[in-house]
Each structure stands twice: as C-alpha cells, then as structure tokens.
C-alpha cells in the first residue's frame, strides 16, 4: 500500500515518542562518533519536518524516501570529513548506493571510551533533572557502540531502564535496588546485540535464503503444532523485519515488527499454546516475549519422516520442481520433531539431504542411491553431542574462569595472529557457554550450546573482517555459516605461526591491578595468558598452568604488600625471569 509520504506514514504508525527514539538510534548507528547534542539536533529537525508532512502529505519533500531524507540530513554534518574520513564520500552518491555506503562504514568495534557507570546518586539526580535527555542518552550510547542492535528491542531495553530508575531512585537503598538491574540490562543487552549481529551477518554475507532457512528451523522448533504454510508466512514476515533493521530501515522495521506481533497474537490458536501470556502484554513487552517464548509441545503421533522424504516415489520430482518448498518442508518436519537439536545442526542435516538428492536424482535408480540418507545424519548429530559432553565435563571440573583459560589457550594456538583483545573477548564469551548451557538437561544442551557458540564465533568473524590477519579465520567465517563452529573446532595448532618476540613490558604489572574488579583482574591475567601462548605456542598445559599459578600468587602477594608498587616492580622482574626459564624462552 503506497503512501504519499512515507515519513508521515511512519510517524503516524509509530507515534512521536517511538519515531524520535528510532531516528536517534538510526543516526547514532550510522554516525557513531558524533556528539549526543548533534544527534538530538538532527532528530529534532527530522521530527519537525515529519510533523509538517503529517499535516500536509503533499508538502515539499514529503514524498521523498526515508533513505533520501535521513541521508540528506546526515550529510549536513559539518565535521563529516574530518571525523569519518572516507565515509564522507558516501554523500556524493545517490540512493540506494549512499545508504549501502553508510552501512558498509558501520564499525563493530568503534574507538569509543568505555562506558563508566557514575555513582547511583549522580545517576538518580540526572534522571530526575531531565528524564527525557537521560533516556535519549542511553539510546545514543548503546546504539553507537552496537551499530546493529535490534532497534525495536532497544526501545524495550530503554523502557526497562526507565522503570529501574523510576523504582530505585525512590528506594531506601538505591544502589542495592538499581545496580543489579543495571547489571542485568547490560548483560542482556550485550547478548541481544550479539544475537542480532548474527542475524544481520547471515542476511548480508549469506543472503536471504540462509536467514530464511535458519528461521524455518527455529520457528518450527518453537511452534511445532503450526502448519508448514503458517510457519512459512511467519518466516517471510520475520525475514522482512530483520532485513529492514539490518539495512538501517528502523522505522519500517519497528512498524512491521509490531504488525507481526499483532498477527501472531490474533492467530495464536493456529501457532502455539504458549503465546497467551505474551499476547496480554503491551507492544514492546509483547514482541520481546514472543521472541523468547518457550517451545510448544510437539504434536502426538507425528509420522515417520521416511515416508515423505525417502520412501515416496515423488521425492526427486518434488525436489527438482521446487527445492525451496520441498527442502523447507523437510527442515520444518525435522525441526518440529527435534527441539533437542541446535538450529545449525538441523541446517547441516538439511544440506546433507539436499546434497544427497542432487547427487542421486539423476541416477538410474534414485531410490537405491538415497535410501540410506538418514544414516548419513548419525555422525553429524554425534559430533556436537560428543563435543558438548566433553566440554561440559571440563567446565564442571574447572569452573568458568579456568574453563575460559583453557579455551583461551586452545584458540590462541589455533589462530595466534588474531589480536589479543579479540581473543580474550571471544574466548571469555565462549567459556560462558558452560554456565549458560551445561546446567540444562541433555535435551536442551545442544540447542543452547551450539546456537550460542554460533553467536560468539560470529563476533570473532565480524571483528576479524574489519582487520583480517588470519586466512584460517577468514576461511571458517566465509565458507559456510552453519559449519563455522565445526570448522573452528577442527583447527589444530597453527604450525606456520612464527612466535612473537618476547617483550617484558607486556608482562609488567602495577599496583592499579589491585583496585580492579574481579572481572577486570581476570581480563588482565587472561591477556597475559594469551601473550604467553603467542610467545610460546608449543608450551604445555602444565607449563602454562604453573606460570599462571605463579602469576596469581604474585598479584595476591603484591596487593597485600605495604609498598605495592615496589613489590610489583621487584617481584615482577623475578616472575618474568622465572616464567622465561619455565617456558624455555
């Protein structure tokens, strides 16, 4: 349905508050270095313009596309060239190339200062003094650091952020009330950002079909009672929503997401019995709730898959005439029967099935050729099962910190060229799979673990893409979306790596380590561990453990000393010498 003025249409659909918030998010995700005040000014200008279009859709420029309007506005920023360099060249292009250009310049790791949380009283004062500015600043700071954050979901986070301050700034113990809520929002926010980044990478690097396949598998697990046609409709709509958000079309995305939530709730009887509670909530909570809803129960007495996908005489005809439909049905039927499998495993099985049909259907006896196709699935299923079993055992034996360290060593040996901060960040996140997933029963472990690992490895892939240093990482990241984890798992020690020159400065520590939080102290030690492996990639687990134990003792000792700085200087030299000797450096 064509509208005379797209900007008026979206303003009316979303309302002023959401319109302004989404435009701010869009601008902050494109121009990540611009000051808050500059963005607020641009947003206000766009909002005033939108209001003129609501009043008269035929007014000048109201018929322009949102990309044209927003791009023109972004290109008015005076400091574009000096702040963003070649991104300024985007402004010389016409739409749609200009928007594509802006998208290509989004930075997953922007050079921005770490967000330091002020004192609770300071935050509460700022919140009370100007609630609107305080919340806008939250949107701005998150959006610029997470340029692919799912915009409608960020509105939900902002709503919760506001609720936390509204409640806790009146509490007797403000800090006890507020800080856990902020920690929870921060951790959930990081997880949400990473999950959305994978969706965007899937769409942008592997295409719409890859995303749709993922969505068919996931929605079929979640809504196993829904018919294939219903799942297909939801997949089409969900793909449109995420394509829009990943493409910077945040107003359309938020609007379409609301429409999808409305449709799901109006048709919940034919979708899932688990949606009732979600559908009673207000819009933002409703959409979030639907996205996180638990899997419905599987229908009883589902027939064997073999009848339609192995034994039927029409298998090859159906495959050849409409691969998307036939393989989509295969994926749907397999996924709804297997909530215990990861989505990526289901996609591997579907790919194996497809490859077998492609190989067999032109043969003299196609059925004989593909009759044992389901047997080919067994090793594919067992591989992640065994890996998860082994790693959960290791996690239970070591605990999270030491499990992370084991992964740090493992991944540094696999891809030592990757920057130390990236290896630390990614390995720490990989290590969190233990506490996140190993507590689950067998039936929930694989979907939890392997799909989480896909999200974390995508972080490695997007960070590495910015400054590629390892052909092995590039290969695992680009060859197959669903085989990224097996590809990284299969990597052995990189024998071509030339060990890094020893630099004592890397292993010099100061008294400031004593005032760090436990998390920050862990990161310091893990950074040292990565550097150690880069210097001595052939070091054994035992050697590394001994050095790290000595290091932990050294930090503990010097943090208890009266003259901490002297202790770090003198004992540090001894530790470096002892470590070099222990590792044969």
């Amino acid at each position: 349905d064509a509208h005379k003025s797209e900007v008026a249409h979206r303003f009316k659909d979303l309302g002023e508050e959401n319109f302004k918030a989404l435009v701010l998010i869009a601008f902050a995700q494109y121009l990540q270095q611009c000051p808050f005040e500059d963005h607020v000014k641009l947003v206000n200008e766009v909002t005033e313009f939108a209001k003129t279009c609501v009043a008269d859709e035929s007014a000048e420029n109201c018929d322009k596309s949102l990309h044209t309007l927003f791009g023109d506005k972004l290109c008015t920023v005076a400091t574009l060239r000096e702040t963003y360099g070649e991104m300024a060249d985007c402004c010389a292009k016409q739409e749609p190339e200009r928007n594509e250009c802006f998208l290509q310049h989004k930075d997953d790791n922007p050079n921005l200062p770490r967000l330091v949380r002020p004192e609770v009283d300071v935050m509460c004062t700022a919140f009370h003094d100007n609630e609107e500015t305080f919340l806008k600043k939250y949107l701005y700071e998150i959006a610029r650091r997470h340029p692919y954050f799912y915009a409608p979901e960020l509105l939900f986070f902002a709503k919760r952020y506001k609720a936390a301050f509204t409640e806790c700034c009146q509490a007797a113990d403000k800090a006890a009330c507020l800080l856990p809520k902020l920690d929870e929002l921060r951790d959930e926010g990081k997880a949400s950002s990473a999950k959305q980044r994978l969706k965007c990478a899937s769409l942008q690097k592997f295409g719409e079909r890859a995303f749709k396949a993922w969505a068919v598998a996931r929605l079929s697990q979640r809504f196993p009672k829904a018919e294939f046609a219903e799942v297909s409709k939801l997949v089409t709509d969900l793909t449109k929503v995420h394509t829009e958000c990943c493409h910077g079309d945040l107003l359309e995305c938020a609007d379409d997401r609301a429409d999808l939530a409305k449709y799901i709730c109006e048709n919940q009887d034919s979708i899932s019995s688990k949606l009732k509670e979600c559908c009673e909530k207000p819009l933002l909570e409703k959409s979030h709730c639907i996205a996180e809803v638990e899997n419905d129960e599987m229908p009883a007495d589902l027939p064997s898959l073999a009848a339609d996908f192995v034994e039927s005489k029409d298998v090859c005809k159906n495959y050849a005439e409409a691969k998307d439909v036939f393989l989509g049905m295969f994926l749907y039927e397999y996924a709804r029967r297997h909530p215990d499998y990861s989505v990526v495993l289901l996609l591997r099985l579907a790919k194996t099935y497809e490859t077998t049909l492609e190989k067999c259907c032109a043969a003299a006896d196609p059925h004989e050729c593909y009759a044992k196709v389901f047997d080919e699935f067994k090793p594919l299923v067992e591989e992640p099962q065994n890996l998860i079993k082994q790693n959960c055992e290791l996690f239970e034996q070591l605990g999270e910190y030491k499990f992370q360290n084991a992964l740090l060593v493992r991944y540094t040996k696999k891809v030592p060229q990757v920057s130390t901060p990236t290896l630390v960040e990614v390995s720490r996140n990989l290590g969190k799979v233990g506490s996140k997933c190993c507590k689950h029963p067998e039936a929930k472990r694989m979907p939890c673990a392997e799909d989480y690992l896909s999200v974390v490895l995508n972080q490695l892939c997007v960070l590495h893409e910015k400054t590629p240093v390892s052909d092995r990482v590039t290969k695992c990241c680009t060859e197959s979306l669903v085989n990224r984890r097996p590809c990284f798992s299969a990597l052995e020690v990189d024998e071509t790596y030339v060990p890094k020159e020893f630099n004592a400065e890397t292993f010099t520590f100061h008294a400031d380590i004593c005032t760090l939080s436990e998390k920050e102290r862990q990161i310091k030690k893990q950074t040292a561990l990565v550097e150690l492996v880069k210097h001595k990639p052939k070091a054994t687990k035992e050697q590394l453990k001994a050095v790290m134990d000595d290091f932990a003792a050294f930090v503990e000792k010097c943090c208890k000393a009266d003259d901490k700085e002297t202790c770090f200087a003198e004992e540090g030299k001894k530790l470096v010498a002892a470590s070099q000797a222990a590792l044969g450096l």
């Epitope: 295409g207 719409e208 079909r209 090859c316 495959y319 050849a320 005439e321 409409a322 691969k323 998307d324 439909v325 497809e354 049909l357 492609e358 190989k359 067999c360 259907c361 032109a362 043969a363 003299a364 006896d365 196609p366």
Partner: antibody
Framework: EVQLLESGGGLVQPGGSLRLSCAVS????????INWVRQAPGKCLEWIGI?????TTFYATWAKGRFTISRDSTTVYLQMNSLRAEDTAVYYC???????????????WGQGTLVTVSS | DIVMTQSPSSVSASVGDRVTITCQSS???????LSWYQQKPGKAPKLLIY???KLTSGVPSRFKGSGSGTDFTLTISCLQPEDFATYYC???????????FGCGTKVEIK
C-alpha cells in the same frame, strides 16, 4: 571416446513437427542425464529440458506442451510439435556432469543440428 | 520471472590483458548453481567453471570464477590468443524448469 551426435534437423514448415535424435556412444546412457539446449542464430543459449537416467523428464516453462524428451538404450530424442519461426536454432544435446541432477553443469556436448522453421 | 544479465555484451582486449565479465541473476541462483561456458564460432559450448568458482578439469588456472547469490564474475587473468570467444553464464534455481543462460559476452581482439 565419449560422443554425443545430434541428427534430424532440417527445414520444416510452421505448424509442423520434427524429431531430433542424440546418439550417445562411449558411455552407458542408462547412467546419465541428458539435456537439450538450443541457440538461435546470434542469440542466447536456451535450456529446453532434461531426461534423467531413470527416464524422468523436466522442461523449461516455455517448452512444456510442445516439446517432449524420450530415450532408448543409446539415443535420446526431442520431439517438437507446432513449430514456429522463432524455434529456428541450432539444437544441442548435452550431458549433465555426473553427481548432479538439477544443476546447469553440462560437460559433454554434441556438435548441434540446425532446425529451420520457415514457409 | 528469472532474469540473467551478462555484462558487458562485448569487450575488446589484447593478449596479456585481464578481462572481467559479470553475471547478475534475479532472483539469486540456488546454492551457487552457477556455471561459465566458453563458445567459439561454429562449436558447442565448453564448461569452464561450475559451482561459481570450481574449475573444470583441464581448464587453465587463469580462469577464475567468484561470487555468490545474485552477483558473479568470471575473470581471465592473462588473456591468451585461444581465449577469444563468447562466454556464457548458466544458472540453476529452486525449480529445474527455470534453468537459464545469460546472453553472452564476446571477447574480441582489440
């Protein structure tokens, strides 16, 4: 040596019919998929259809109804009915690369046979 | 409707030149089902590349295929006298009935 050899081309009047043959030697035809592809003078290649080793056939959307592919033990046939001037082209038979069924990978081709539809 | 657009329709080049031919498909091809053929006057086409980037046995390594989804490229890195010919891309889709070829790029001597 593996060879595909088309025959049966020639001049035919609009509305007429023609049956082309593709004689296959050097391989056991019962194990391979064979396609028909045509090329109008100075124009694009155009896929007509395929017959799998099992005898199952598929056709380009535009070719359904007027064109029929069949086979015996050593020869693949293309039956063309209700011919029109725009069917004038060189007609090739071509083998699909073994191990594929629906992919457009044709590794062995005949030399082609010219069909002219004119009154 | 399936549309496969090859560009340029012709290119003049000299021996030793690098030549790039593009093939754009709408919609995207199925699972990188994209091939490149070489055809010389009066001859049948010859398969050079399949699965977008895999070289057929016996084809010189100066031929390189790349791309995925909707955009594909054939690059001849160092043109040889025997490379002057017409090049076609071929695409496979969700339905076998949609198998389509591009309309060719003629590589001529400058």
């Amino acid at each position: 040596e593996v060879q595909l050899l088309e025959s049966g081309g020639g001049l035919v009047q609009p509305g007429g019919s023609l049956r082309l043959s593709c004689a296959v030697s050097g391989i056991d035809l019962s194990n391979y998929a064979i396609n028909w592809v045509r090329q109008a003078p100075g124009k694009c290649l155009e896929w007509i259809g395929i017959i799998w080793a099992s005898g199952t056939t598929f056709y380009a959307t535009w070719a359904k109804g007027r064109f029929t592919i069949s086979r015996d033990s050593t020869t693949v046939y293309l039956q063309m009915n209700s011919l029109r001037a725009e069917d004038t082209a060189v007609y090739y038979c071509a083998r699909t690369v073994p191990g594929y069924s629906t992919a457009p990978y044709f590794d062995l081709w005949g030399q082609g046979t010219l069909v002219t539809v004119s009154s | 409707d399936i549309v496969m657009t090859q560009s340029p329709s012709s290119v003049s080049a000299s021996v030793g030149d690098r030549v790039t031919i593009t093939c754009q498909s709408s919609p995207s091809v199925w699972s990188n089902f994209l091939s490149w053929y070489q055809q010389k006057p009066g001859k049948a086409p010859k398969l050079l590349i399949y699965e977008a980037s895999k070289l057929t046995s016996g084809v010189p390594s100066r031929f390189k295929g790349s791309g995925s989804g909707t955009d594909f490229t054939l690059t001849i890195s160092c043109l040889q006298p025997e490379d002057f010919a017409t090049y076609y891309c071929g695409g496979g889709y969700s339905s076998i009935s949609d198998t389509t070829f591009g309309c060719g790029t003629k590589v001529e001597i400058k």
